[in-house]
């Protein structure tokens, strides 16, 4: 009985370690202050785990503000860059590729690239310098590599269920039997819940990759990691869809979970995350 013989696939190279900050002020949000100057400064973004530009008003604000990118990196970054799990087939996109262009709330004027799901192409946009979402790339090349489609418009799985690359929908057939799945969603979905460094008690949700469920946790208000969602639905959208079915010819097919009216699904093989 194949169900009894368990294979334990240990994810080692895609696991994102919990964010460990060198200084607690690196967790502060970018604060432009109440003044009206327009000064280019840098801050450490705990969500992208990178130092980024923002526009500083010239007074007050907080310590997460640096004159140069180098100074910011020196004070706040370690060698634990956020890695995106790349899918085997080009058309298998991380879920953030489908997010809308989001300039964020800051007043910077930074050229970035985003994947436009309407045109199916990566396009330029102006990023404010803080917040926004993960559909935000420094180079056109990076955006294309991660989000643009490969040569094939769709794949067909071994049950005859057609996956349409245009809308990522599955055409339902009948009750399905299990197949091997791998996780190819955003890497932070595999990280443990992290309360962060502050003292608030905010209700948030995180994706528990051991059980495949979004669960509530208390967030301290700062720090932590990207596995942090304000609603259960947002958590499910971001993390529960990133499973790829490995088919017999070595290709991969993405199935979208949590779609309305979806009646037919395919089961998932266990994936273990080291040190969870």
């Amino acid at each position: 009985d194949s169900e009894e013989d368990e294979e334990h696939t240990i994810i080692t190279d895609t696991e994102l370690p919990p964010l460990k900050l060198m200084h607690s002020f690196c967790a502060f949000k970018a604060d432009d202050g109440p003044c009206k100057a327009i000064m280019k400064r840098f801050f450490f973004n705990i969500f992208t785990r990178q130092c980024e530009e923002f526009i500083y008003g010239g007074c007050e604000g907080n310590q997460n503000r640096f004159e140069s990118l180098e100074e910011c990196k020196k004070m706040c970054t370690r060698d634990n860059a956020n890695r995106i799990i790349k899918t085997t087939l080009q058309q298998e996109k991380p879920d953030f590729c489908f997010l809308e262009e989001d300039p964020g709330i800051c007043r910077g004027y930074i050229t970035r690239y985003f994947y436009n799901n309407q045109t199916k192409q990566c396009e330029r946009f102006k990023y404010g310098g803080c917040l926004g979402n993960m559909n935000n790339f420094e180079t056109l090349e990076e955006c294309k590599n991660i989000c643009e489609d490969g040569p094939n418009g769709f794949q067909v799985d071994n049950y005859g269920t057609q996956l349409n690359a245009v809308n990522n929908s599955l055409t339902p057939q009948s009750t399905k039997v299990p197949s091997l799945f791998e996780f190819h969603g955003p890497s932070w979905c595999l990280t443990p819940a992290d309360r962060g460094l502050c003292r608030a008690n905010e209700n948030r949700f995180y994706y528990n990759s051991v059980i495949g469920k979004c669960r509530p946790f208390k967030y301290s208000g700062c720090g932590g990691n990207e596995n942090n969602f304000t609603s259960k639905q947002e958590c499910l959208r971001a993390c529960k869809k990133g499973f790829i079915q490995r088919i017999s010819k070595g290709g991969l097919i993405k199935t979208k979970r949590k779609r309305k009216k979806q009646r037919v699904k395919i089961a998932y093989e266990e994936i273990f995350v080291k040190n969870m």
């Epitope: 169900e3 009894e4 368990e6 334990h8 009750t175 399905k176 299990p178 799945f181 990759s209 051991v210 059980i211 495949g212 469920k213 669960r215 499910l236 499973f243 979970r257 949590k258 979806q262 009646r263 037919v264 699904k265 395919i266 089961a267 998932y268 266990e270 994936i271 273990f272 969870m276």
Partner: antibody, heavy 118, light 107 residues
Amino acid sequence: QVQLQQSGAELVKPGASVKLSCKASGYTFISYYMYWVKQRPGQGLEWIGEINPSNGDTNLNEKFKSKATLTVDKSSSTVYMQLSSLTSEDSAVYYCTRWDRFDGFVYWGQGTLVTVSA
Amino acid sequence: ETTVTQSPASLSMAIGGKVTIRCIISTNIDDDINWYQQKPGEPPKLLISEGNTLRPGVPSRFSSSGYGTDFVFTIENMLSEDVADYYCLQSDDLPYTFGGGTKLEIK
């Protein structure tokens, strides 16, 4: 082969406590959450709670918060459930079951019958 | 707490007949429903897991459908070995909750 071996039947007096065990084998113990389910004679199933064997974190059904305590011993790959202040309402078969991500409760222990009687 | 209302509580069906069991959930659980079969003296056996997914080794006469709050479990061409209790379980929200069960007998 995955196996969940539960401890034997218990006959206990009202007001007493009992500790049930569920020994896991055939898989990486800390990689799966373990759950407990109650079934009174001739009745339906009731979810008691879950334990994460890797760190001992638990979630209990509100109804069982003052009744059940879940613990784990990683060295012996065993989870325990202690039931306290027993009454006749606690007479039931108690199952441990493993949660498989996206598959559900595929593997179950054989059940432990607890009879509370003076 | 998410409540699960299962119907009917009991059901008599002739061999070869079609059995339909329904579970209504008090909140939207997407497709996080599971269906179990339990025979006397045995633990429950998972037939269909989240997403209306038939488990390995389970005969194809068993199926399920539904999304959100309304779910249906079906046995086509009932056999004598299908006599058992059947339960649905919602695994979307804590605490997980079972339906009250359906006792299936032969007519």
